[in-house]
């Protein structure tokens, strides 16, 4: 296994609809044709997997049907979007990239993006 640098933004604020997007960029040492991207959430020293996708270069990034993540790839960049976030989902979201093919296998782990999620205040009843 060889180490690889992965860059991602330090902080992202989710929209009022609970959607957060960020770019995960990896420094590929060669021309990878099969890449696996995983988003991990770290909170209270616990690490959980949010979503993952394996894709072939030039093809769409496909997450499972029930995944809260969507994404697109362009070169060595992956544009990730996480949906359905609530205030309780605030935490550090880490991008992990694995170059599966061709050999050698590379693993890169970003420093994480702190995603802040603020639940919208319910609209007060208005009299007309």
């Amino acid at each position: 296994c060889k180490a690889m640098h992965v860059a991602q933004p330090a902080v992202v604020l989710a929209s009022s609809r609970g959607i957060a997007s960020f770019v995960c960029e990896y420094a590929s040492p060669g021309k990878a044709t099969e890449v696996r991207v995983t988003v991990l959430r770290q909170a209270d020293s616990q690490v959980t997997e949010v979503c993952a996708a394996t894709y072939m270069m030039g093809n769409e990034l496909t997450f499972l049907d029930d995944s809260i993540c969507t994404g697109t790839s362009s070169g060595n960049q992956v544009n990730l979007t996480i949906q359905g976030l609530r205030a309780m989902d605030t935490g550090l979201y880490i991008c992990k990239v694995e170059l599966m093919y061709p050999p050698p296998y590379y693993l890169g782990i970003g420093n994480g993006t702190q995603i802040y999620v603020i639940d919208p205040e319910p609209c007060p009843d208005s009299d007309f």
Partner: nanobody
């Protein structure tokens, strides 16, 4: 924790065929590179073949055209079909899995199965 169990080794004559199988326990089979290494007595361990989750394969030059690796996601198994076997293919063949578990890189190994090519 993933466990790998190999089967299918044995004694075969030169020019013969053998099929090795590796069964993986655990639910991380689909995200790991799976493959085979071999080690002959007094020699260094060498990669034979491996296969990615996407089905891309990689072979040692010495086995290209003779060996075929495959994976069955439904059964969590990796197979190695070995044809036109030669005496120099005699070795202990070990299944391996390489990938990552959360923030850690992992490599798992099977216990190995003996393949002997002799007349």
């Amino acid at each position: 924790e993933m466990q790998l169990v190999e089967s299918g080794g044995g004694l075969v004559q030169p020019g013969g065929s053998l099929r090795l199988s590796c069964a993986a326990s655990g639910n991380i089979f689909s995200r790991y590179i799976m493959g085979w290494y071999r080690q002959a007595p007094g020699k260094q361990r060498e990669l034979v073949a491996d296969i990615t989750p996407g089905g891309n394969t990689n072979y040692a030059d010495s086995v290209k055209g003779r060996f075929t690796i495959s994976r069955d996601g439904a059964k969590n198994t990796v197979g190695l079909q070995m044809n036109s076997l030669r005496p120099e293919d005699t070795a202990v063949y070990s299944c391996y899995a390489r990938g990552s578990d959360k923030l850690l890189m992992r490599t798992y190994w099977g216990q190995g199965t003996q393949v002997t090519v002799s007349s």
